[in-house]
């Protein structure tokens, strides 16, 4: 708490301007009217206040708006937003996309903080839905935000937003999320040529179906093992040894080190040992020569 002291003569602020930049904490508290501050919040961001001074300004706004700031003030918080706590933000009702953008811009360069997460949550709740404009804005500032959404929420993500996604932003996505994102990425990158397309689509391939993997195997893409290990098991199982060899190119030798891990383990169990032997990697566990493979799932479907 800043102690209450009278404002020195001639120091009373008539407007929020740079004359305040070297005011001491107690002078700001005593000489700046909270209502004046609220109406001129847009000026604060242009003035080089220290964090200590920003704390005083925040305290004045908190006193003026104990139930939470109005959106007219929130939109112009600028760097003062960095001083807000999640508890402060939970009191807000943010409905304007412009307000959201203004605050995300302030936080640009920072990781997604609890404050930003709370702001986004308040915004989405205030709007009642995750519309395309909102998602476009959020993925532009935080591409990693995609992985925090449910598959249902992801279904409304516009393919154009996919362009902003970096590979590391998908690290926390689970297969259900990638199942939704992959078709969007495929659509977003459809006009790129083979090698460029593969570079862009690579991090989304955890959602790719078998037929797309087969198609990629015909394009000399040389998929690395890390990407292969993230593919859907059900999409990998129908691939032939020749297709996997073409898909991985020179990286095919890495299968040996991964033979006990999914999806490689399960894929090996589905291949004829004769075919596996053609790779010359010493992969074991394939179907012995002379054995007949019955697809029981097919048999059940027919009956």
């Amino acid at each position: 708490e800043v102690e209450k002291t009278a404002c020195p003569s001639g120091k009373k602020a008539r407007e929020i301007d740079e004359s305040l930049i070297f005011y001491k904490k107690w002078e700001l508290e005593a000489c700046v009217d909270a209502a004046l501050l609220a109406t001129q919040m847009d000026r604060v961001n242009a003035i080089p206040f220290t964090y200590e001074q920003l704390d005083v300004l925040k305290h004045k706004l908190d006193e003026l708006y104990p139930q939470g700031y109005p959106e007219s003030v929130i939109q112009h918080l600028g760097y003062l937003f960095l001083k807000m706590s999640p508890e402060d933000i939970r009191k807000w009702n943010v409905t304007s996309l412009e307000t959201l953008k203004a605050l995300l811009e302030v936080n640009k360069g920072h990781e997604m903080s609890p404050q930003v997460a709370t702001l986004i949550d308040r915004f989405v709740k205030g709007r009642g839905q995750l519309d395309k404009d909102t998602l476009d804005t959020l993925t532009a500032f935080y591409p990693g935000y995609l992985c925090s959404l449910s598959p249902e929420e992801l279904s409304s993500v516009p393919p154009s937003s996919i362009w902003a996604v970096r590979p590391q932003d998908l690290d926390t996505c689970d297969p259900r999320q990638l199942d939704v994102l992959y078709p969007k990425a495929r659509l977003a990158f459809q006009n790129m040529n083979g090698s460029e397309y593969f570079v862009k689509i690579q991090s989304f391939l955890g959602g790719a179906p078998t037929e797309d993997l087969k198609a990629l195997s015909q394009q000399n893409v040389s998929m690395d093992l890390a990407t292969f290990m993230k593919l859907r098991t059900d999409a990998v199982l129908p691939l032939t040894v020749a297709e996997v060899q073409k898909l991985l190119g020179p990286h095919v030798e890495g299968l040996k080190a991964e033979e006990r891990h999914r999806p490689v383990r399960d894929w090996i169990l589905r291949q004829r040992q004769d075919d596996l032997d053609t790779l010359g990697l010493g992969l074991q566990g394939g179907i012995p020569n002379g054995y007949l493979v019955l697809d029981l799932s097919m048999q059940e479907a027919l009956s």
Partner: antibody, heavy 121, light 106 residues
Framework: EVQLLESGGGLVQPGGSLRLSCAAS????????MSWVRQAPGKGLEWVSA????????YYADSVKGRFTISRDNSKNTLYLQMNSLRAEDTAVYYC??????????????WGRGTLVTVSS | IQLTQSPSSLSASVGDRVTITCRAS??????LAWYQQKPGKAPKLLIY???SLESGVPSRFSGSGSGTDFTLTISSLQPEDFATYYC?????????FGGGTKVEIK
């Protein structure tokens, strides 16, 4: 090109005076608060003084208060530091610096090359 | 506010992970910047607001911390990174700098 260029440094006797200048170019000078930061030979950085964009507000470190005066002429895009009653411990390279990014901040992304002030008899 | 940097100097090799710490005498929230300075040159801003990377600065530089304890990390030291590093607080006046950490070639 956005740049700051200091001048006016040199050798001065203890008790003497010197006026440093910092010529700014490539940006709207009057919109930015400016600072002087110094560095004694082989030592660290010390924030000496600052001035608001209009020149109406100033700040001085205790070590120079009453001896140094910061000012600016926005029509000439120039920052000044008038140094009086100089002491041996004022020997340093003097840099002018500011923050050019969006919004007012008190860290510095634009620096001049510095000018050396040597106080010695 | 006093800023204490440690170590004051260190020797490292290209490719090493280097960590420099800056401790404030009182809490300064995230009001901390980091600079790199090479001999005869002006300081260069690397990090602001404790963890935000200045535009154009390589991603091998990162900052962390809040309150009183802060860290600058260089994930894989490059030949051009041998220099002196300073922290600076802008929580309150007067603005103050740490004493510096000189990173030398081992």
């Amino acid at each position: 090109e956005v740049q700051l260029l200091e001048s006016g440094g040199g050798l001065v006797q203890p008790g003497g005076s010197l006026r440093l200048s910092c010529a700014a170019s490539g940006f709207t000078f009057s919109s930015y608060a400016m600072s002087w930061v110094r560095q004694a030979p082989g030592k660290g950085l010390e924030w000496v003084s600052a001035i608001s964009g209009s020149g109406g507000s100033t700040y001085y470190a205790d070590s120079v208060k009453g001896r140094f005066t910061i000012s600016r002429d926005n029509s000439k895009n120039t920052l000044y530091l008038q140094m009086n009653s100089l002491r041996a411990e004022d020997t340093a390279v003097y840099y002018c610096a500011t923050w050019m990014g969006g919004g007012g901040r008190w860290y510095f992304d634009l620096w001049g090359r510095g000018t050396l002030v040597t106080v010695s008899s | 506010i006093q800023l204490t940097q440690s170590p004051s100097s260190l020797s490292a090799s290209v490719g090493d992970r280097v960590t420099i710490t800056c401790r404030a005498s009182q809490g300064i929230s995230s009001a901390l910047a980091w600079y790199q300075q090479k001999p005869g040159k002006a300081p260069k801003l690397l990090i602001y607001d404790a963890s935000s990377l200045e535009s154009g600065v390589p991603s091998r530089f990162s900052g962390s911390g809040s309150g009183t304890d802060f860290t600058l990390t260089i994930s894989s030291l490059q030949p051009e990174d041998f220099a002196t590093y300073y922290c600076q607080q802008f929580n309150n006046y007067p603005l103050t700098f740490g004493g510096g950490t000189k990173v030398e070639i081992k």
